[in-house]
Interface confidence: medium
Amino acid sequence: SGTTNTVAAYNLTWKSTNFKTILEWEPKPVNQVYTVQISTKSGDWKSKCFYTTDTECDLTDEIVKDVKQTYLARVFSYPAGNVESTGSAGEPLYENSPEFTPYLETNLGQPTIQSFEQVGTKVNVTVEDERTLVRRNNTFLSLRDVFGKDLIYTLYYWKSSSSGKKTAKTNTNEFLIDVDKGENYCFSVQAVIPSRTVNRKSTDSPVECMGQEKGEFREI
């Protein structure tokens, strides 16, 4: 229940990639505005996105304070132009979000192959250690900083002339693989957190192939 000219938000959804975290909801407002609050299970509520007509709110600044905490958000509905007005219970209508634990649930962004270098029959493939929006001591932490050994990468590689893929895994950001001399190879990587139950894998990186700009070829 509530005032006749406000409706409660619904379909509250967390959208999060590499800790960039936005709460989305419906409906598009008609004669109403929204305010979002966020809290940890044991903490105080903090208000964000005051009296907005948007149906999303960037909560990154809050969740990066401790990505291992579990957060809950709620969206309040107010009549446009009369934000002091409340529902029949003496407070504005609101709806709770699902719980969200960034460390366990943020999507892994698409990785990028930084470089590859061939030395004889070995190729070293390096994955870019992507920076997140988690910040400590004037340092934007990388995915590796945040996830440490929980994060692995899977490399898919194949001869340019065939479609048969091989795989390799690393718990660093580098692979060292054996290749056939004189053959060109293509590479794609995927970030993986094996211990997760949801959002375990990223999308595959763009494919990079030997004989193109990014790599370096040294025959020894």
Epitope: K65, D66, Q69, V134, R136, N137, L141, S142, D145, T172
Partner: antibody
């Protein structure tokens, strides 16, 4: 297995200089922030400084107590962390530890066994 | 640099009892405080980060609270293995350890 092994401690006269080393193995050195922490005899731990990882350009930060006298550097080809100490004082006498630093929760997750510096005339 | 004033410097307690340690920062540290346990001959072990978040594998007998400049750390139902020196560490602006609290058995 992650290993950190400090070396280079000893007896130095006040005003002297010394360089400590920390040889590391068992992890990709360039991906981690590295730090120095000391503990004078019978006293508390004291953070001295850290050097950031490759993703953050290997930049350094220092505590006020050693800034301008101590310099942290790293040899990423040899996986060695250094602490260059100049204009040493008697109050710099301590056991010096290198530690791997996980910045997100301020965790020193691996420590060396320490090397002892005595500054005395 | 931010200063951390930790108290008491030592305390004694009985097995099964509870102890509380406090740390006061020289300025607001935005809840960026961690608590470490240090035993002789070992590297310090992180117990709690961001004021109250327990590290994986740390029993819930350990807890932390606080905000602004004032923070506290408690151990309940004391066990023999809890005998150690405990340090607070602020990580809001660089890093600063407190002076440590030596916990002994009565």
């Amino acid at each position: 297995e992650v290993k950190l092994v400090e070396s280079g401690g000893g007896l130095v006269q006040p005003g002297g200089s010394l360089r400590l080393s920390c040889a590391t193995s068992g992890f990709t050195f360039t991906e981690y922030h590295m730090s120095w922490v000391r503990q004078p005899p019978g006293k508390a731990l004291e953070w001295l400084g850290f050097i950031r990882n490759r993703a953050n350009g290997y930049t350094t930060e220092y505590s006020a107590s050693v800034k301008g006298r101590f310099t942290i550097s790293r040899d990423n080809s040899q996986n060695i962390l250094y602490l260059q100490m100049n204009t040493l004082r008697t109050e710099d006498s301590a056991t010096y530890y290198c530690a791997r630093l996980t910045m997100v929760v301020a965790e020193f997750d691996y420590w060396g066994q320490g090397t002892t510096l005595t500054v005395s005339s | 640099d931010i200063q951390m004033t930790q108290s008491p410097s030592s305390l004694s307690a009985s097995l099964g009892g509870e102890v509380t340690i406090t740390c006061k920062a020289s300025q607001d540290i935005n809840k960026y405080i961690a608590w470490y346990q240090h035993k002789p001959g070992k590297g310090p072990r992180l117990l709690i980060h961001y004021t109250s978040t327990l590290q994986p594998g740390i029993p819930s007998r350990f807890s932390g609270s606080g905000s602004g400049r004032d923070y506290s750390f408690s151990v309940s139902n004391l066990e023999p293995e809890d005998i150690a020196t405990y340090y607070c560490l602020q990580y809001d602006n660089l890093l600063t350890f407190g002076a440590g609290t030596k916990l002994e058995l009565k």
